[in-house]
Structures are given as C-alpha cells and as structure tokens.
Interface confidence: low
Amino acid sequence: YDFTNCDFEKIKAAYLSTISKDLITYMSGTKSTEFNNTVSCSNRPHCLTEIQSLTFNPTAGCASLAKEMFAMKTKAALAIWCPGYSETQINATQAMKKARKSKVTTNKCLEQVSQLQGLWRRFNRPLLKQQ
C-alpha cells in the first residue's frame, strides 16, 4: 500500500490521543532502556509502512499483536485516513483470523512494540535521517 496519500495530521491526532497511551499500557513494567531501537524511518509514509508491517505481520516469537488495542486503533486510523487502505487489507484480515486467539505477551512482542513506539515517535515528527 502507498501511504503517501494518507491524512498525516489526522493519524498523528489519533496517535497522540489514544494509540500512544495503549502502547505505553502494553509496555507497562518494561524499562524504556531495555530494548534498542533497530527499526527506523524517515518520511511519514515510510514510517507508516514500517508501523503497518510491525503491527500486523506476524513474526517469529510474536504472532499476536494484531489483536491488541493499539493495533486495532492503528488499523482504524489507517482505514479512515488512508484512502483505499481497507481494500488492501482483506487478505491480511483473513490471516489475522487464523492467528492464535489467545493474547500472549512474549519478550519478543515487547521488543517489537518498543520498536513501534520509536516508529510512532518518528512519525509524529519525522527526523529525516539517512536511509
């Protein structure tokens, strides 16, 4: 999906008002210095690409993020403020339904959400670092 057509300010508002708090809730009890940020982004569309990938694509050791509150709110924000986004996510939704129904917070998931926090901060104010 090409995120360049999204309404960035509306997504930013959604992040600041709710998504950021849900990310903090998920990470509660974890030291902010525990994980190093290894995923980066420069432009806001690039940040959304990385956020979408980390939030909704199951990874080894962390298959359950898509059912978390921050993920559902992220999906809603993208669906509302990125034209045509919903249509591209039909297959992804089917895959999500096949994922485990139980929500398990593994260390790998905590690390992944820590990366997401960094990406969202970059999206909130892109730092235009070297690719």
């Epitope: 360049t4 432009n43 104010r125 892109p126 235009l128 690719q131």
Partner: antibody, heavy 117, light 107 residues
Framework: EVQLVQSGAEVKKPGASVKVSCKAS????????MHWVRQAPGQGLEWMGM????????TLIQKFKDRVTLTVDKSTSTAYMELSSLRSEDTAVYYC??????????WGQGTTVTVSS | DIQMTQSPSSLSASVGDRVTITCRAS??????LAWYQQKPGKAPKLLIY???TLAEGVPSRFSGSVSGTDFTLTISSLQPEDFATYYC?????????FGGGTKVEIK
Amino acid sequence: EVQLVQSGAEVKKPGASVKVSCKASGYTFTTYWMHWVRQAPGQGLEWMGMIDPSDSETTLIQKFKDRVTLTVDKSTSTAYMELSSLRSEDTAVYYCARTLDGYYDYWGQGTTVTVSS
Amino acid sequence: DIQMTQSPSSLSASVGDRVTITCRASENIYSYLAWYQQKPGKAPKLLIYFAKTLAEGVPSRFSGSVSGTDFTLTISSLQPEDFATYYCQHHYGTPWTFGGGTKVEIK
C-alpha cells in the same frame, strides 16, 4: 501566515566568512527541519545541509562539512548558515527552506552572497 | 548519492500547449519526489510532492506521475504565467538532490 525572512545581500572578499540569517514566523519553529540550498548564477539548485531546530542536530553534504556551520536561536526562531573560507565559486543565492517530509513548502526570499576581491 | 537526471534542459512552447518534463532517479526513490517552479530572481515554489500530490494553491493543470524511477511533470494547458524553470528533487533521504532544471520558454 508562514514566513521565512532572510538577511540582506553580502559582498565579501575571498577567505572571509559570511553568516546568513533566516527568521521564521507563523509556525512552531522546532517542529520543522530547516534546510539550506544554494544557487550559483545561472545554475541549478544545490542542497547544502539541514538542521533540526529542536536539538541543533545537523547534516551537511561532504563538500561543505569543513566550511559550513548551521545554528539556530530558538528564542528568536532564527536559523543561521555560516560559510567560511569564501572563494569566488561560493558566489550564489542562498536559500533557507523548511521541511517536514523532505519537500520544501516554504522558502526564504534568498540572500545573495558575492565573493570578489 | 541518488542522481536526478532531468530532461529536456529547455523547451519552447506556446500558450495552450501540453508540456511534459521528465526526471529519472538513479535508484528507486518510490514516490519521494517533488517538483518546483522558479521564476527569475525568485525562490522556488512547490508544485507537487510525493510524486503526484498537488501542493496547496497550485492550479490543477499541473500534475505529476511516476513509473518506476521515471517521474513526469505535466502542464495540461500552458498559461503565460507558467513560463519559468522547473526542478525535480528527491526527498527519499539525505543527501537531497535536484535535477538540473528545465527552462520553459515562449515559442
């Protein structure tokens, strides 16, 4: 209304330094990066570098790393570009431009720097 | 560094003509390309960003498109105020680079 107002034209001798200012208004100064672009007479646009006004982090292209200093004064929402060891090929119009995603939605009016002995 | 090759370097056209300017990136920059218009003695003015998004206040006769690493700026019906120099610029990451410019002159 967003505005970037640059300092006036300068005439300098080779070897001297010049400091160009760019005063921002109409937006939150620390939210946007400030970039500097120059244009030699009759030539195209050349990106020089950028500064993050929130923490003064700078990125400069290799050819300017030794001679350009980018600074900001947050209290006055002003960005500065200082170019040292001036030579004749530095004669150009210098622009400041703000950006969030890498494209420039607002530019300063330009400052002409003439290097002549 | 990413090189931006812009063509033609100049062109002559008449009012009402359809004008096309192209820019080729030396590597994949996705949609991270902007177009600017510059008139003599003035700062450049943003026309298009993210390859095809029209900047605020820019007339709809300007449009942008992308195919792989090839980018196109089209002016559907050239107006007297459109005679100027046009630059492309990638905004994929540092260092930002500009195309060499295309001067649109009156035929």
